[in-house]
Interface confidence: low
């Protein structure tokens, strides 16, 4: 699972792996923002979300380490799209809090909390330059999180952070074809923390998925299922409170 890439490169072909430093690697922020293994989310850097960027009010200590505190429950009736904060993949133009299915802009679930497991339909499948953004909070004493990009009964991309596998925290990625799991790809960088808010962004590229967590590029996973247009559902499960799940084109 290589971690070279950048939004700028993704869009321009320049080969730059990390534009805003998704902070470090994609987008506009340092990747270190609070929380690889052994690091806690520093409560000392709350920062302030840009006006209007995050509806609602961030609870005390809500992932302050990353650029932009994540919000608590949005204000009634607000349907935010992907957060506008220093995203690894800044969209073109100004991010906005949009309706669930606006004419343009992010599509997806209304602001939460959402019921987990949650299925996000991806009508027409996935396509390059599609950015899927998931916001939530890891439950205390969490054991696992799973994202499953599904093509019928197959799982094109299984993204599975495990909080305690033989006393280790590890992210396992895999593909399931004809009910058989393939070769696991493992990543020991583990940016999730029990009880902490998170943002997962998955950028679809022509030959791989790129995953960033809390605005830091984490990994990429080469497509094993080539018919991207048939990957029509994202299943979100595990020990999380899910705030929003949405997608947009960048």
């Amino acid at each position: 699972m290589a971690d070279n890439f950048s939004l700028h490169d993704a869009l321009s072909g320049s080969g730059n792996p990390n534009p805003q430093g998704w902070p470090g690697a994609w987008g506009n922020q340092p990747a270190g923002a609070g929380g690889y293994p052994g690091a806690s989310y520093p409560g000392a850097y709350p920062g302030q979300a840009p006006p209007g960027a995050y509806p609602g009010q961030a609870p005390p200590g809500a992932y302050p380490g990353a650029p932009g505190a994540y919000p608590g429950a949005p204000a009634p009736g607000v349907y935010p799209g992907p957060p506008s904060g220093p995203g690894a993949y800044p969209s073109s133009g100004q991010p906005s809090a949009t309706g669930a299915y606006p004419a343009t802009g992010p599509y997806g679930a209304p602001a939460g909390p959402l019921i987990v497991p949650y299925n996000l339909p991806l009508p027409g499948g996935v396509v390059p330059r599609m950015l899927i953004t998931i916001l939530g909070t890891v439950k205390p004493n969490a054991n696992r999180i799973a994202l499953d990009f599904q093509r019928g009964n197959d799982v094109a991309f299984h993204f599975n952070p495990r909080f305690n596998e033989n006393n280790r925290r590890v992210i396992v990625c895999n593909t399931k074809l004809d009910n058989n799991w393939g070769r696991e790809e493992r990543q020991s960088v583990f940016p999730f923390e029990s009880g902490k808010p998170f943002k997962i962004q998955v950028l679809v590229e022509p030959d791989h998925f790129k995953v960033a967590v809390n605005d830091a590029h984490l990994l990429q996973y080469n497509h094993r299922v080539k018919k991207l247009n048939e990957i029509s559902k994202l299943g979100i499960s595990g020990d999380i409170d899910l705030t929003s799940a949405s997608y947009t084109m960048i």
Partner: antibody, heavy 119, light 107 residues
Framework: QIQLVQSGPEVKKPGETVKISCKAS????????MNWVKQAPGKGLKWMGW????????TYTDDFKGRFAFSLETSASTAYLQINNLKNEDTATYFC????????????WGQGTSVTVSS | EIKMNQSPSSLSASLGDTITITCHAS??????LSWYQQKPGNIPKLLIY???NLHTGVPSRFSGSGSGTGFTLTISSLQPEDIATYYC?????????FGGGTKLELK
């Protein structure tokens, strides 16, 4: 080529305000966060924090909260550091440095701006 | 806050020598370590990112290694232009922190 060009040296009195500029060129300004780093005379480097050049959101470390402000003029691809109520201990060279493509790495730096605070 | 302990604080070497500078993090930073070179009166320049990757334009005599808490910068066949102060910096978590620096001098 990528360049960060900072404003010139400043001599100020305690209690005054200074605003340092950092003009970026050679890359898409809003794609990379901008850091500010302090280096006191004869001392090492100290990270002050950074500003998200896409959203304008600043992040300050504990030691640089309060009197310090990061800002942007995106249309001019310029980042600013303002220090209010200057103190003698603010005497230092201040560098802007853009984030690179990997976690935490600052790949290009400005030439530094010397700020001298003296009564 | 993650403390970065760099050693030695100063080092004398001869041209052509191979020199090693170490950096120890107070907690696991995986591979999120950068090395910078600052020549006297000059600006810091990125040498190595992600512990072992050479930044654009950096000569191949510079190399980095390590992960977790222990990291090393090696300069093989020391050149006159390598005389500088070298800093490590962690990018694992806020606040990003630098080592105290290693001043490299000629014998």
């Amino acid at each position: 080529q990528i360049q960060l060009v900072q404003s010139g040296p400043e001599v100020k009195k305690p209690g005054e305000t200074v605003k340092i500029s950092c003009k970026a060129s050679g890359y898409i300004f809003t794609n990379y966060g901008m850091n500010w780093v302090k280096q006191a005379p004869g001392k090492g480097l100290k990270w002050m924090g950074w500003i998200n050049t896409y959203t304008g959101e600043p992040t300050y470390t504990d030691d640089f909260k309060g009197r310090f402000a990061f800002s942007l003029e995106t249309s001019a691809s310029t980042a600013y550091l303002q220090i209010n109520n200057l103190k003698n201990e603010d005497t230092a060279t201040y560098f802007c440095a853009k984030f690179g493509n990997y976690v935490g790495a600052m790949d290009y730096w400005g030439q530094g701006t010397s700020v001298t605070v003296s009564s | 806050e993650i403390k970065m302990n760099q050693s030695p604080s100063s080092l004398s070497a001869s041209l052509g020598d191979t020199i090693t500078i170490t950096c120890h993090a107070s907690q696991n930073i995986n591979v999120w370590l950068s090395w910078y070179q600052q020549k006297p009166g000059n600006i810091p320049k990125l040498l190595i990112y992600k512990a072992s990757n050479l930044h654009t334009g950096v000569p191949s005599r510079f190399s980095g290694s390590g992960s977790g808490t222990g990291f090393t910068l090696t300069i093989s066949s020391l050149q006159p232009e390598d005389i500088a102060t070298y800093y490590c910096q962690q990018g694992q978590s806020y606040p990003y922190t630098f080592g105290g620096g290693t001043k490299l001098e000629l014998k």
